[in-house]
């Protein structure tokens, strides 16, 4: 049997903010899965604190109930059942409350 190896990084990760201060996180599959299983993981950190840790079959996450005036780091990676891949990282910061005129 062929030994598995770490998958490559997910790519084209996007973080889109909606008007209710939730986030829609998507990414494309890694070019090299190198293993038998497919699982996407999303970690959300506020400062150095992990505030979300989700796992989906597809790289499509809705992250709700985020706090205003907080800096968040989004880390998405692929796990092939044996190894995690390198995370794709994006940062988001919000300093002002959303008002209707901004929508």
């Amino acid at each position: 049997t062929t030994k598995s190896a770490p998958p490559s990084q997910v790519w084209n990760m996007t973080v889109s903010m909606t008007s209710d201060n939730s986030m829609h996180v998507k990414c494309r599959p890694p070019r090299d899965r190198n293993g038998p299983h497919e699982r996407y993981h999303l970690e959300v950190e506020a400062g150095n604190t992990l505030v979300r840790n989700e796992s989906h079959k597809n790289c499509d996450f809705r992250v709700k109930d985020l706090q205003y005036s907080t800096d968040y780091t989004f880390k998405a990676y692929f796990h092939n059942g044996d190894y995690p891949g390198e995370p794709f990282i994006l940062h988001h910061s919000e300093q002002k409350l959303i008002s209707e005129e901004d929508l």
Epitope: M17, H92, K96, D102, L103
Partner: nanobody, 126 residues
Framework: QVQLQEFGGGLVQAGASLRLSCAAS???????MGWFRQAPGKEREFVAT????????GYADSVKGRFTISRDNAKNTLYLQMDSVTPEDTAVYYC????????????????????WGQGTQVTVSS
Amino acid sequence: QVQLQEFGGGLVQAGASLRLSCAASGGTFSYFMGWFRQAPGKEREFVATINRNGGATGYADSVKGRFTISRDNAKNTLYLQMDSVTPEDTAVYYCAAARESSVYYTSTDPAEYGYWGQGTQVTVSS
């Protein structure tokens, strides 16, 4: 029809600073906006995004803490302050404005942008 024009690119030494600007004309400046870049032989990649009032920003991990996106709505201008640049920052930098139909407040997704500038070349020498 919104038109975007980038300015401020050029050749700089590693460790230096550079400020890119993007002038918008021909339409309203009321969309979220972003900067993307494309290095030779590589795919276009997200750099930074900013919402309509400047209160929300997003950055790629590779530029976080070095680059700052801002906007002046009175001047219809978007900015990218680039500090501590490295040769890996060498690329053509594109300014982009959201498409009207986007449901988002900010986005790192190029598909959510409907208007693009022609780009400005930034070359960082070591």
